[in-house]
Interface confidence: low
């Protein structure tokens, strides 16, 4: 997946719903990444993706402090960034984008959520003149119903992603339970 022609094209944003009446305060807190799909994501059956968690903290200016906690190389890895509110509630851009070399645009759109159990979030970025997109299935717990997973698969497919670009990270205990 390292040349432009290899990447599945990002879908038009008209095919990506936006959660109606998005409640930024209710979206706060920890979300486990139960599902992950994207044009730069490939399922590796021999080395499956480990689950990670992302914490959303609302700041006074209504942007989010976003921290992802990953278990990598036998230690906890923290990835921190800021999501700044975009054109409409539930849509965000990346704060301080100029500090990320090669990154020219970054969009986050909350597709759907019920806040206390599950969410689907769409991400699109242009980096080194290549357009990447991904969808995350978030859960407040590490397990979600098969119906929600099937819905996630269907949505990912509707954006042009085949099965091998859709993964369900393996639940772990390290780092993400704190």
């Amino acid at each position: 997946q390292d040349s432009t022609s290899d990447l599945i094209p990002a879908p038009p944003l008209s095919k990506v719903p936006l959660q109606q009446n998005f409640q930024d305060n209710q979206f706060q807190g920890k979300w486990y990444v139960v599902g992950l799909a994207g044009n730069a994501i490939l399922r590796e059956d021999k080395d499956p993706q480990k689950m990670y968690a992302t914490i959303y903290e609302l700041k006074e200016d209504k942007s989010y402090n976003v921290t992802s906690v990953l278990f990598r190389k036998k230690k906890c890895d923290y990835w921190i960034r800021t999501f700044v509110p975009g054109c409409q509630p539930g849509e965000f851009t990346l704060g301080n984008i100029k500090s990320y070399p090669g990154l020219t645009s970054y969009l986050v759109r909350v597709v759907s959520t019920n806040y206390n159990q599950h969410a689907m979030v769409f991400f699109k970025k242009v980096s080194q003149n290549r357009e990447y997109f991904k969808i995350t299935l978030y859960g407040r717990t590490k397990e979600l119903t098969s119906e929600l997973k099937e819905n996630f698969i269907r949505f990912s497919k509707s954006l042009g992603l085949p099965e091998n670009h859709i993964v369900f990270p393996v639940p772990i205990d390290q780092c993400i339970d704190g």
Partner: antibody, heavy 118, light 106 residues
Amino acid sequence: VHLQQSGSELRSPGSSVKLSCKDFDSEVFPIAYMSWVRQKPGHGFEWIGDILPSIGRTNYGEKFEDKATLDADTVSNTAYLDLNSLTSEDSAIYYCARSRFEDYFDYWGQGTTLTVSS
Amino acid sequence: QIVLTQSPAIMSASPGEKVTMTCSASSSVSYIHWYQQKSGTSPKRWIFDTSKLASGVPARFSGSGSGTSYSLTISSMEAEDAATYYCQQWRTNPLTFGAGTKLEIK
């Protein structure tokens, strides 16, 4: 019944008409795409366009860009199709059809017959 | 736009006979979906994601294919299967349908 469409319409050439489609699934309506599709007698289907009610974003088939206007009301969970400058060529059955996250339709309305005649 | 060509346009089959109809796309698509329409009624989702049967569809129906070539098969024709079947794609806008295959009972 998931999608309930308005009744048959008879219109004169040059006039306009507004068709409606009510979705009884209020949870799904705002985040589902509502498409409009027309079927002429003895013919296949033509996709007119779709709307995402939560943000009012629309897509139109090229043929219908100047003919159709899509709208939606998330309070009444109703989608609308406006057709202008009607001619006899616009006589057809018009269906609303819903697509959730998928690229197919899970439900169709019962259809509205539009007859354009002088 | 992606053009879907269905064949045959009209066909008839005796009860118990195996039926196959095809849908050919002008360029590659990820999935094809099929709808059944009977005279005077609105279409019903019949087969989606190429091969998955919609709720209530008899197991004698199946769908298959990939790329530009897809098909719908009925393993053993029954009178209630007489209808027009349409294929559909939405890989790109505009969404397009095939012209339909009308299946009659002999």
